[in-house]
């Protein structure tokens, strides 16, 4: 008589997570009498997947009625597949006995589960950096299968090339994770810039997933300072202005010093926003020129976003004409009350 064979026709089957899988198995003979069992894996650690005689296998059903006379098809149907179901499934024929004796195994069918990657999460540097410096952004996505995946980086629509990507684990697994780190050189115009991490995978049907991060969270554009004076209508007053230009973020503290001594401190409030996302601000003083004696140096000192202060000084210029307007008895502070423009 012909020796019994257990035939598993498919070497591999691939399904998408959430779908059902059919694993085919037929035997070539009804003899000897005995059950068929399905296992995932081989050896002593193999896992029983289906046993007609006993056990509770809520997601596994037989394709045909295995109790039907002359049935030689022992294919099974597994519903609601998850990545954890991946593995090699063996259809095994046993000879009836006490206990049943394993007789023959099929060659195995490898079930691979296609699973979508999670939405990419992009995280930026923990501290801000200034233009011309390089910052790193990290993109992570998890839970996908198969392992093949494509990740691209863009800055304002332009593809970046300076990045490193790792997919883990290196070997076969039920699902995988990707982590990529891109290096971006900042420019002064990057307040409105955005980096995009784009992930393409077979499960996404050509519609890649994207994660974004704003460079506004990563950049600090330090201000430029300019101090100048303008005459006022009143002949014994001049306007000294500190123009703070092109800074980001908004957090700014300005201190006026008279000959090195703190005169007043202001926090930037009413700011003007530039097209590139940076800000301008100006603070000004009304200076009583008659209170001037041996020359006054006014210093505008700016502390931006908690960084060390930068300053610009201006030696007060008092014309001979202005000096003539002052009587010998004139006194009072050099600096008159001010208001920001």
């Amino acid at each position: 008589e012909e020796e019994l064979q257990v035939i598993q026709p498919e070497k591999s089957v691939s399904v998408t997570a959430g779908e059902s899988a059919t694993l085919n198995c037929t035997v070539t003979s009804l003899i000897p009498v005995g059950p068929i069992q399905w296992f995932r894996g081989a050896g002593p650690g193999r896992e029983l997947i289906y046993n007609l005689k006993e056990g509770h296998f809520p997601r596994v059903t037989t394709v045909l009625d295995p109790t039907k006379r002359n049935n030689m098809d022992f294919s099974i149907h597994i519903s609601n597949i998850t990545p954890a179901d991946a593995g090699t499934y063996y259809c095994v024929k046993f000879r009836k006995g006490s206990p049943d004796v394993e007789l023959k195994s099929g060659a195995g069918t490898e079930l691979s589960v296609r699973a979508k990657p999670s939405a990419p999460v992009v995280s930026g540097p923990t501290a801000r950096a200034t233009p011309e410096h390089t910052v790193s952004f990290t993109c992570e996505s998890h839970g996908f299968s198969p392992r093949d995946i494509t990740l691209k980086w863009f800055k304002n629509g332009n593809e970046l090339s300076d990045f490193q990507t790792n997919v883990d684990p290196a070997g076969k697994s039920v699902s995988y994770s990707i982590r990529s780190t891109a290096r971006v050189v900042l420019t002064r115009r990057d307040v409105h810039s955005q980096v995009i991490c784009e992930v393409a995978h077979v499960t996404l049907q050509g519609d890649p997933l994207r994660g974004t991060a704003n460079l506004s969270e990563a950049i600090r554009v330090p201000p430029t300072l300019e101090v100048f004076q303008r005459p006022m209508r009143a002949e014994n007053q001049v306007n000294v202005t500190c123009q703070v230009r092109k800074f980001y973020p908004q957090r700014l503290l300005l201190t006026w010093l008279e000959n090195g001594n703190v005169s007043q401190t202001e926090t930037a409030s009413t700011l003007t926003e530039n097209k590139d996302g940076t800000y301008n601000w100006r603070s000004w003083l009304l200076v009583n020129t008659c209170a001037h004696r041996d020359g006054v140096v006014l210093t505008c000192q700016v502390e931006h976003d908690g960084q060390p202060a930068v300053s610009k000084s201006h030696a007060l210029e008092v014309s001979a004409h202005q000096k003539e307007q002052c009587s010998d008895t004139t006194s009072g502070p050099v600096l008159a009350p001010t208001a920001p423009l």
Epitope: A42, P44, G45, T88, E102, S105, A170, S173
Partner: antibody
Framework: QVQLQESGPGLVKPSETLSLTCTVS????????WSWIRQPPGKGLEWIGF???????FYQSSLKSRVTISLDTSKNQFSLKMTSVTAADTAVYYC????????????????WGQGTTVTVSS | DIVMTQSPLSLPVTPGEPASISCRSS???????????LDWYLQRPGQSPQLLIY???SRASGVPDRFSGSGSGTDFTLKISRVEAEDVGVFYC?????????FGQGTKVEIK
Amino acid sequence: QVQLQESGPGLVKPSETLSLTCTVSGGSIRDYYWSWIRQPPGKGLEWIGFIYYNGRTFYQSSLKSRVTISLDTSKNQFSLKMTSVTAADTAVYYCARVRAYSGIGLDGTDVWGQGTTVTVSS
Amino acid sequence: DIVMTQSPLSLPVTPGEPASISCRSSQSLLYSTGYTYLDWYLQRPGQSPQLLIYGGSSRASGVPDRFSGSGSGTDFTLKISRVEAEDVGVFYCGQALQTPLTFGQGTKVEIK
């Protein structure tokens, strides 16, 4: 091809815990058994235990109370912990891959690490 | 536990000549599926063991065809058709039918 590399301390004090890690490179953890085998000086091979990729573990009965084998698939590593060591645990410790195909038995220990010498001494 | 017994424990050999090692198991390693769960290993001096034969008679990848395995049930033999100098070391048989995996005591092969 697949390579295995053992790492861990070469000297352990009596009554302390021996910890070894085996890193799998160039291949997959899936579908194999991952074994620890030791060889005392001048003696033969003694199987300690193994772990299947699905996490199921099997141990030498005489060592079972002292041994734990674990698997970290994200790092492609598996580990051995042996508590309350004595001088009798001095040996070269090998990590190895055991193949499984189809039936209940196994198909040969086909990949071995180079071995790491562990001495138990105060 | 399945006990594996090898003989001889020491085997002086002449290069170019055949050699044979015997291994006996305390219970049958022939499983109901017809597969024999018996493996042979060679441990060269200062090296890790390497798999030579699995399933009683199948040569592992890269193993020269001068090595062959035979036998079934409880009695097994490893034959080397023509011994070469690189074959010196300790040969072990091992069973993979059930846990614990067990090995023979080893047969030390050395050049005469």
